[in-house]
Amino acid sequence: AIVFIKQPSSQDALQGRRALLRCEVEAPGLVHVYWLLDGAPVQDTERRFTQGSSLSFAAVDRLQDSGTFQCVARDDVTGEEARSANASFNIKWIEAGPVVLKHPASEAEIQPQTQVTLRCHIDGHPRPTYQWFRDGTPLSDGQSNNTVSSKERNLTLRPAGPEHSGLYSCCAHNAFGQACSSQNFTLSIADESFARVVLAPQDVIVARNEEAMFHCQFSAQPPPNLQWLFEDETPITNRSRPPHLRRATVFANGSLLLTQVRPRNAGVYRCIGQGQRGPPVILEATLHLAEIEDMPLFEPRVFTAGSEERVTCLPPKGLPEPSVWWEHAGVRLPTHGRVYQKGHELVLASIAESDAGVYTCHAANLAGQRRQDVNITVATVPTWLKKPQDSQLEEGKPGYLHCLTQATPKPTVVWYRNQMLISEDSRFEVFKNGTLRINNVEVYDGTWYRCVSSTPAGSIEAQARVQVLEKLKFTPPPQPQQCMEFDKEATVPCSATGREKPTIKWERADGSSLPEWVTDNAGTLHFARVTRDDAGNYTCIASNGPQGQIRAHVQLTVAVFITFKVEPERTTVYQGHTALLQCEAQGDPKPLIQWKGKDRILDPTKLGPRMHIFQNGSLVIHDVAPEDSGRYTCIAGNSCNIKHTEAPLYVVDKPVPEESEGPGSPPPYKMIQT
């Protein structure tokens, strides 16, 4: 048997919102579940579709979903069928509509003292509650001789009089929400004695010193009074004109004329009509002084031939709004063609080189005229004047590669070296004409170079190979002064490169031959055991066929390298006592001693009274303080050699002797006591 585990149940739903009718079945065999609406099968749509066995609504529709839904489960093998309980939606909705005249039948039949009934066509479920408004102000039952029936959605005015004139609107709300009338009703009930507008003044824009005219007429029985006021409520009459309206004239027909308008005349003018009965009718019009601001500058524009381009002219701010037009070569552009004006835009369709030039945007109104030029360049693809060529450049000298092109606008040239963009630095310089200068050619500059010349219209490129002609040079140049340690083995290297591999030899500067214990092995001068006599001037000579020879002079000094006879020791001193840091070094030439304390060299000429460096190199510090603590370095150096040794200095407080300690008790650490 087919059993419903979940049955659909009737429920509230909201128009346009999601909803779900639930259905779940259990059966021994395979069952096919479908839905009925008022007995007819429900077809799946994007809005309403089956989800499992349930029926899902993406947006409930009060018209398409009204009725009775039923879930049907059918066993297609046995033919057994089960139907769920009926379920329906209580759909809540609200829909806006217009305010319409219900009585009398037409507006033409509305007369003073007749009954007027308006109907609010807002519908909804549950039945909405209505609220009426006149000129935006809520109306309540019994207010000013009208009867409001919000339940019946009607507003009855009995009897209707001129005081009921106005714009009638309605709003309604229910459980779904709120809606207001889509179209409102203007009720106009005339009273002959009320002032009625015949001619209303219009806003006026005039140029300075021009004249402005405002027309204003009212009608009523008996004829109404008419009065003009300006801005600050100052009345304007032919007898009493305010100082700033000396040139104002009020005509018998109600028109107001202002001559030779000045900025102070600009503002709001009120024309007031007062009938024998009823409220005053106030009409306003504004007098604006015409003005026009300057136009913003155009950036020069570069376009490519064959393309379509537009240039927008932003009109300057102005009153009245300025009219805009484009001119080229003194001729106004047409509104169609290949080069034409469309709105505020200059349109160039399928640009030709001949379109280049100055185009002018003009703007004008009552206040005057403004103009602004835009320079349009039509870009062309560059052409060659001089391509880069394969070149041999000399090492150490400046080298040039040319890339001369012409185009409109002036092309930009970039260079690549081994496919890498060359950025200008101290060695590379790209001239305005596109030439690349290599300031100091180096061996590794021998590679491929490519130049690319571009404009917005396109680009051209060419490449060239650079071969570097290597100069004859020492690599590296020998140090001009070198030291050798006495009685030790020593070598002095010398190497060179050139376009051809150079031969290298050493000789003594005085021309004498090298002793037998000194050998010249492929440019390396080798001393088996250095003697005092080996000191002197030597020359390294490098030569090849095409480039000749070069020489490097070296002065060799023989020295006994520095050793320390006495080195400073780790020292601890009581505060206020004297510290002695000993240092003595030997070597040839005789070494000089310098001290470094707290990471700075101690200058003997600026030591002050507490410090002193003795002839033998020892450092003495009197009246030591805690800030003297630190690492002290003894540096011994001569023209050939430099050595250093260091020791820490600790400054400590002198302990107060305890009673148990005898006068001769030793301190707890090694001390210098003075």
């Epitope: 979940k6 049955q7 659909p8 149940s9 009737s10 429920q11 509230d12 909201l14 346009g16 919102r17 999601r18 909803a19 779900l20 639930r22 379920a87 209580n90 809540k92 459980a175 779904f176 929400g177």
Partner: antibody, heavy 119, light 107 residues
Framework: EVQLLSSGPELVTPGASVKISCKAS????????INWLKQSHGKSLEWIGD????????VYNQKFMAKATLTVDKTSNTAYMELRSLTSEDSAVYYC????????????WGQGTTLTVSS | DILLTQSPAILSVSPGERVSFSCRAS??????IHWYQQRTNGSPRLLIK???ESISGIPSRFSGSGSGTDFALTINSVESEDIADYYC?????????FGGGTKLEIK
Amino acid sequence: EVQLLSSGPELVTPGASVKISCKASGYTFTDYYINWLKQSHGKSLEWIGDINPNSGGPVYNQKFMAKATLTVDKTSNTAYMELRSLTSEDSAVYYCARGDYYGSNYNYWGQGTTLTVSS
Amino acid sequence: DILLTQSPAILSVSPGERVSFSCRASQNIGTSIHWYQQRTNGSPRLLIKFASESISGIPSRFSGSGSGTDFALTINSVESEDIADYYCQQSNNWPYTFGGGTKLEIK
């Protein structure tokens, strides 16, 4: 992870208005209704209304129609409720909650915003 | 509006006991009832939807039953962490409404 983050506590004077927010994260904001509920101290919950973040269309409990205005800002995945003409009766904890697809039950809740109306 | 009446207002049980909360609707609402737990100073948490459907992440000791107008929430074996207020909510008619709640206390 679905999260609703309510704005901090508010202390306002009678007659004033207040706008509280609820920032959603961890799911597609426009796919689910955001509901607003009121719980006065020691009392049960009252449903104020809900809003469809996709269309911005609210539905109100009639009781709160003149009191609450529901809005959303899709760009910041944030729902707002403005309460106006406040009185001491409006002092409560206000929750935002995300419903299931149909908006019939509330499976994710904000931590609540405490509103105190006092002179 | 549909009125949901929860009874009793307070339930006092010992840990391990079985407990049932009742919720009665003022009219037939099918199975459109949902149950929530709210611990002190916390936000409500959905326990059961559509009268009997379980919610992922909710312990299996919570179950729901009923249709039409009478509904129940059952905790099979009460634990100390179940101390809270329990509310039912209907989604059959607008506006959606909640019951007055039942407070669960541990003896």
